[in-house]
């Protein structure tokens, strides 16, 4: 009751920093759990366009913000040009897929790839054919698609001409998009996916300045950013509800990225509150207005008075449950650099499995697919990446402790990523990929690695067996 | 160091208008609100309202609405409040402070500017 | 508006004596007060924000807590230093109040 009093938020998931065995969801006496997933669990792999395609302006592809940013901030990165060049080498990722033998593939679409200046007329032939095909491969081998419509590379033309995000014009200019993706390949998708990680594209792109569009200082930029994604997610969601679901049957969410922490001092309820704000001020900040009560948390609205636009009482009721699943992003995008305000000088940790629990608690236990998770190694490590198995198999552990221990509905994971690509601010100097593309070749072989070998066993055994 | 320096003492008369500094340095400037904040002879402390110096956006109380400008000029980071159609009871010290987002508090504070209002 | 009510509006203390004050908002503003110290002549400092959080470099013999209406703040050995006038402020609600302030001084 104190906790509740205090700390001021409306969820649950302070508890889960009470270390009150009474109290806490998450029973620590389970350090590893040699278990199996629940049957049919969706085990799958992702990548990112901007990441893996390359030719970023070959067959009448427009450039992206991302495109500009790399030519303009990024020293010693001549451009996304060479990548594992997907684009190009399409059979390559299909052979790879079939190889780990996942349940579904999450990729996405490349917006200015189909429409080069971002406005939706006639689509660019070479990109939707690119896409149909792969689609039309991934059906045939029973791999489902889960697309995703934005993953940060928006049409520069967009973001010269409005501004990008910052300008609401672009809320129907990106439900255009969305509509004719629904229309062209909502037949073969039946998991969509509009936006990776708009904390992210707030945070980094209108505050750091460590991703595109790179400005930065500006807060009031970021939260009128995070505000456009998350009206342009409602709206698409709504679209998407009202005219394709009917007939395509599919689900619909947006994927959130998270850090997670713990408390200097674990009795100490203060420190328990900055976690809690911690969480709030990341996570919350999106999950809130879609899984929660269609508004920003609370403390948000105490503190960025000046700055955090207000969701009128009618778009409270429009943002308020537009996701069919909650789809959960845990990775180093959201710990390294982390955002010093969200450390509330705190414990940065890895738990998986005690964010998935804050999720269950402050989002009224909502089915959850982890959409990206894994870690990184240095751009030197080749095929023998035992530092990724390890991180793997922790993460896993904790997907699995969530489920059996916890009750937490976890019913797909995606590990990221097919293959080594272009990462963001870190360039080329990390590797993420279960596959090695040594970028300086001609033909960009897929190679696997220990991981790929590994996660290949997890799916076959649908878990860890003794 | 954060330090937030401002504008000598003013005499006014009724009817005029003032307009306060406060120089910031020790920071970025344009990544946090400047508040204003002002305390009369022997009264306790009252807001005015708000100035985000990268967009230039403000937000005051009711009570200075229509009397008060908050301005900036970005290059010499510098925040201004202009206070027009003085009374006497506008007679007391103008503070500026800067707004901490994760706290939701003045973290730092200038020294203060006395302004008298006397015919 | 909200309005915050401080008291008691003066106190004499002895250096080492346990000093509390209490702060009441006119309506629940949860977690959402600071605390500030103010000399004369000086700039207004911040000892605590959101209800106990010390401010870096503040020291610990200052202390905040309640929730909700209620409220104190709390200096556990009362220092020749800490001779000021103490205010609480709350930001639930625009525009940010202030309480009356409560003076300090050594007897």
């Known amino acids: 009751i104190l906790l509740r009093a205090v700390t001021g938020f409306s969820g649950d998931g302070r508890a889960i920093w009470s270390k009150n065995p009474n109290f806490t969801p998450v029973n620590e006496s389970q350090l590893f759990l040699y278990d199996t997933f629940p049957k049919n669990f969706f085990w799958g792999i992702g990548t990112g366009a901007l990441q893996v395609e390359g030719s970023w302006k070959k067959d009448g592809k427009g450039p992206s913000i991302w495109d500009h940013f790399i030519h303009t901030h990024l020293k010693n990165v001549s451009s996304t040009n060479g990548s594992s060049d997907s684009y190009i080498f399409l059979e390559k990722d299909l052979s790879a897929l079939d190889f780990i033998g996942v349940s579904f593939y999450q990729f996405s679409i490349s917006w200015p790839r189909l429409f080069p200046d971002g406005i939706v007329t006639v689509a660019n032939a070479k990109g939707l054919q690119y896409y149909s095909t792969l689609l039309d491969a991934l059906v045939l081998r029973n791999i489902e698609p889960i697309v995703t419509l934005y993953h940060w590379d928006l049409p520069l033309a967009l973001q010269e001409k409005y501004g990008g995000w910052k300008n609401d014009t672009i809320i129907d200019i990106f439900n255009d998009y969305a509509t004719y993706c629904f229309q062209m390949f909502g037949d073969r998708v039946k998991y969509w996916i509009t936006i990776h990680n708009p904390y992210l594209v707030a945070w980094h792109g209108y505050g750091t300045g460590m991703h595109a569009p790179g400005e930065k200082g500006n807060l009031a930029a970021v939260y009128t950013v995070g505000h456009n994604l998350i009206k342009a997610h409602s709206k698409v969601w709504h679209n998407y509800n009202t005219h394709f679901r009917p007939h395509q049957k599919g689900w619909l969410s947006i994927t959130l990225g998270s850090h997670w922490i713990e408390p200097n001092r674990s009795e100490n309820t203060m420190d328990i509150f900055k976690c809690q704000q911690s969480m709030v001020s990341v996570l919350g900040w999106f999950a809130n207005p879609i899984h929660g009560d269609g508004d920003y948390p609370e403390g948000m609205r105490k503190k960025l008075f000046s700055v955090l636009p207000i969701f009128s009482e009618a778009e409270k009721h429009e943002m308020r449950g537009t996701a069919d699943f909650f789809a959960f992003s845990f990775g180093p995008n959201n710990f390294k650099p982390l955002n010093t305000m969200a450390k509330m000088g705190q414990n940065v940790s890895l738990n998986l499995r005690e964010a998935l629990n804050w999720i269950k608690l402050e989002y009224n236990n909502p089915r959850i697919l982890i959409a990206e998770n894994g870690w990184f190694t240095d751009s030197r490590v080749k095929t023998e990446d035992t530092t990724a198995i390890y991180m793997m198999k922790n993460f896993l552990s904790q997907v699995l402790q969530a489920i059996r221990l916890d009750e937490i509905r976890v019913f797909g994971y995606t590990a990221w990523s097919l293959l080594d690509g272009f990462e963001w601010q870190d360039a080329y100097t990390i590797r993420r990929g279960l596959f090695y593309v040594d970028f300086n070749s001609k033909q960009k072989e897929r190679k696997p690695k220990s991981s790929a070998h590994y996660y290949k066993q997890i799916i076959r055994e649908n878990g860890f067996s003794l | 160091q954060v330090q937030l320096v401002q504008s000598g003492a003013e005499v006014k008369k009724p009817g005029a208008s003032v307009k306060v500094s406060c120089k910031a340095s020790?920071?970025?400037?344009?990544?946090?609100?400047i508040n204003w904040v002002r305390q009369a002879t022997g009264q306790g402390l009252e807001w005015m309202g708000w100035m985000n110096p990268h967009s230039g956006n403000t937000g005051y109380a009711q009570k200075f609405q229509g009397r008060v400008t908050m301005t900036r000029d970005t290059s010499i980071n510098t925040a201004y409040m202009e206070l027009s159609s003085l009374r006497s009871e506008d007679t007391a010290v103008y503070y500026c402070?800067?707004?901490?987002?994760?706290?939701?508090?003045?973290?730092?504070w200038g020294q203060g500017t006395m302004v008298t209002v006397s015919s | 508006d909200i309005q915050m009510a401080q008291s008691p509006s003066s106190l004499s203390a002895s250096v080492g004596d346990r000093v509390t004050i209490t702060c009441q908002a006119s309506?629940?503003?949860?977690?959402?007060l600071n605390w500030y110290q103010l000399k004369p002549g000086k700039a207004p400092k911040l000892l605590i924000y959101d209800v106990s959080n010390l401010e870096t470099g503040v020291p610990s013999r200052f202390s905040g807590g309640g929730s909700g209406t209620d409220f104190t703040f709390t200096i556990s050995s009362l220092q020749p230093e800490d001779i000021a006038t103490y205010y609480c402020q709350q930001y639930d609600n625009l525009p940010l109040t202030f309480g009356p302030g409560t003076k300090v001084d050594i007897k």
């Open positions: 309506q629940d503003i949860s977690i959402y």
């Open positions: 020790g920071y970025t400037f344009t990544s946090y609100d």
């Open positions: 402070a800067k707004y901490n987002w994760n706290y939701g508090a003045f973290d730092f």
